[in-house]
């Protein structure tokens, strides 16, 4: 169908709540394009009909509650005039529980899941809540080990626990809870956030934290395309280069020629204390000689790789 | 460093009252749930109910309903609990827990005995 | 409320020996489940936070886990100091309910 295909990363989510994945590949999504979304390689696309539990709203994919059953891969098309990307989204999840926030033994966690708060502060938790305009959410209400947080040291501003003088006793099993309302019903939105605390200055001292990748391999089929973001959290003050190599080259130096293979533009999101920078690498084609290779992310003195493996065959097609 | 410092040994007569205080230090007193719990002689342990010092907010055990009153003395970071109408079945090591992290730090105990 | 069933009662063991403990909640807490070690005359110490998290200074023989509705605490390897009573905590809801406790006595 001359659609290029393009895999990002896992995402985990929690069962019976609501979940919405925005599909922005930019700087595809930045003109004039379609984007229909799919499940499990089905050619029916997913409803835009707002009364459908899952359904497509823009450029989202929504699921008003999120179920067992939902787990899988969904793809969302992206045509352009002279273009076309499919981009592949494994959703994955797992049973969540009122008051269950220690998930901290589940893979490839995002860092929304993991905050840190510094000790002696004024620092903050986020709730991270991704979903389209049409979703309205209510105030957000703040648990620590299943009870509300309240006291003076403790103020919500939007999405953010604001905590003031941080302390050792901070640490712990956090949850965030909002309301979301979505054509006139209203659902339940719950996140568990494991706080632990650093006693050092800035966001880790001067060494950055690489997030993601976490030195694992990836399953990728030969002749796609594949994005893989570095995300890094660093002082704001730093001044550590970010970037990826192979075989202790620059990629974008080692594939000079061919250009196959390529170093993304950085980008970061700075918080208060802290900035969150991401730098992707790009896969045009995967070629046999890319397996086996660790690709490194580098941000100062860290360093962490993936590492591109075959998939498994399925024997099922026989 | 957290300590609870509880209140003396009591003994007391069926149908008097009790009041145990739980002095905390060590950490911001009125940020976190300060729960009671019971234990008999010989027995495994009981939550009575517990107390956020920042309102006063109280949350009680059905059983303790009535029986149980929980104060709190910001000045001096000190909880109480009043135990009522006291029958021998209420002798007991009372301990204070901080719910800095989920119950993390006891007092030392009081031990209240009822007899006549 | 929330009932924590504990087993066994009791138990003896010998030092070197592989202890385990478990807990069933009759429904789900998450993983808001923490282990006690209690001697006689002596507060409780917590050893275990949510189900698995080893409380700062607690030797790491002492482990946690979760099946279901279903916990369990292990000691790798008995040692002297261990022979006490253990408890399990839910705090998913109040009320907040204790296990009935095991004692870990010398064979």
């Known amino acids: 169908d001359g659609c290029k295909d393009i895999f990002m990363k896992n995402e985990i989510l929690s069962a019976s709540q609501p979940f919405a994945f925005n599909c922005t590949f930019p700087p595809i999504t930045s003109g004039e394009v379609s984007v229909t979304w799919y499940k499990n390689s089905s050619k029916i696309p997913v409803s835009k009909i707002i009364q459908s539990r899952i359904h497509q709203d823009e450029t989202w994919i929504l699921f008003l509650p999120m179920e067992w059953g939902d787990s899988g891969v969904y793809q969302c098309v992206i045509k352009g005039r002279d273009s076309c990307h499919r981009i592949h989204v494994n959703l994955t999840v797992f049973e969540k529980h009122w008051c269950d926030t220690s998930i901290g033994g589940l893979p490839n966690l995002s860092d929304e899941y993991k905050q840190i708060l510094h000790l002696g502060k004024d620092d903050s938790l986020t709730c991270h809540l991704h979903f389209p305009k049409s979703c309205v959410l209510g105030p957000i209400k703040w648990y620590k080990d299943c009870n509300e947080i309240k006291g003076e040291r403790f103020t919500v501003l939007e999405t953010r626990l604001l905590v003031s003088n941080v302390s050792a006793e901070d640490r712990g099993n956090y949850a965030c809870q909002a309301i979301l309302t979505h054509s006139g019903k209203q659902y339940e939105v719950l996140n568990g956030i494991t706080v632990s605390i650093t006693e050092r200055a800035g966001y880790g001292g001067s060494v950055p934290k690489i997030i993601y990748p976490k030195n694992h391999s990836i399953e990728v089929q030969l002749g796609t395309t594949l994005i893989v973001d570095c995300n890094v959290t660093d002082t704001k003050d730093n001044t550590n280069l970010r970037c990826w190599r192979v075989n202790n080259t620059l990629v974008d130096d080692y594939y000079d020629e061919s250009k196959r293979i390529r170093e993304g533009v950085e980008t970061h999101v700075s918080f208060r204390e802290h900035n969150l920078y991401t730098v992707n690498i790009t896969f045009l084609e995967v070629k046999m000689e890319d397996y086996g290779l660790p690709f490194m992310c580098h941000a100062g003195v860290s360093t962490a790789y993936i590492i591109l493996q075959l998939p498994a065959p399925d024997f099922r097609a026989y | 460093q957290v300590q609870l410092v509880q209140s003396g040994a009591e003994v007391k007569k069926p149908g008097a009252s009790v009041k145990v205080s739980c002095k905390a230090s060590g950490y911001y007193f009125t940020s976190y749930w300060m729960n009671w719990v019971r234990q008999a002689p010989g027995q495994g342990l009981e939550w009575m109910g517990m107390?956020?010092?920042?309102?006063?907010?109280?949350r009680l055990a059905q059983k303790f309903k009535g029986r149980v009153t929980m104060t709190v003395d910001k000045s001096t970071s000190t909880v109480y609990m009043e135990l009522s109408s006291l029958r021998s079945e209420d002798t007991a090591v009372y301990y204070c827990?901080?719910?800095?992290?989920?119950?993390?730090?006891w007092g030392q105990g009081t031990l209240v005995t009822v007899s006549s | 409320d929330i009932q924590m069933t504990q087993s066994p009662s009791s138990l003896s063991a010998s030092v070197g020996d592989r202890v385990t403990i478990t807990c069933r909640a009759s429904?789900?807490?998450?993983?808001?489940l923490n282990w006690y070690q209690q001697k006689p005359g002596k507060a409780p110490k917590r050893l275990i936070y949510?189900?698995?998290s080893l409380d700062p200074g607690v030797p790491s023989r002492f482990s946690g886990s979760r099946s279901g509705t279903d916990f369990t605490l292990t000691i790798s390897s008995l040692q002297p100091e261990d022979f006490a009573t253990y408890y399990c905590l839910q705090y998913a809801s109040s009320p907040y309910t204790f296990g009935q406790g095991t004692k870990v006595e010398i064979k």
């Open positions: 827990a901080s719910s800095t992290t989920a119950f993390a730090y």
């Open positions: 949510a189900t698995s």
């Open positions: 107390i956020h010092p920042y309102d006063s907010e109280t």
């Open positions: 429904q789900d807490i998450g993983n808001a």
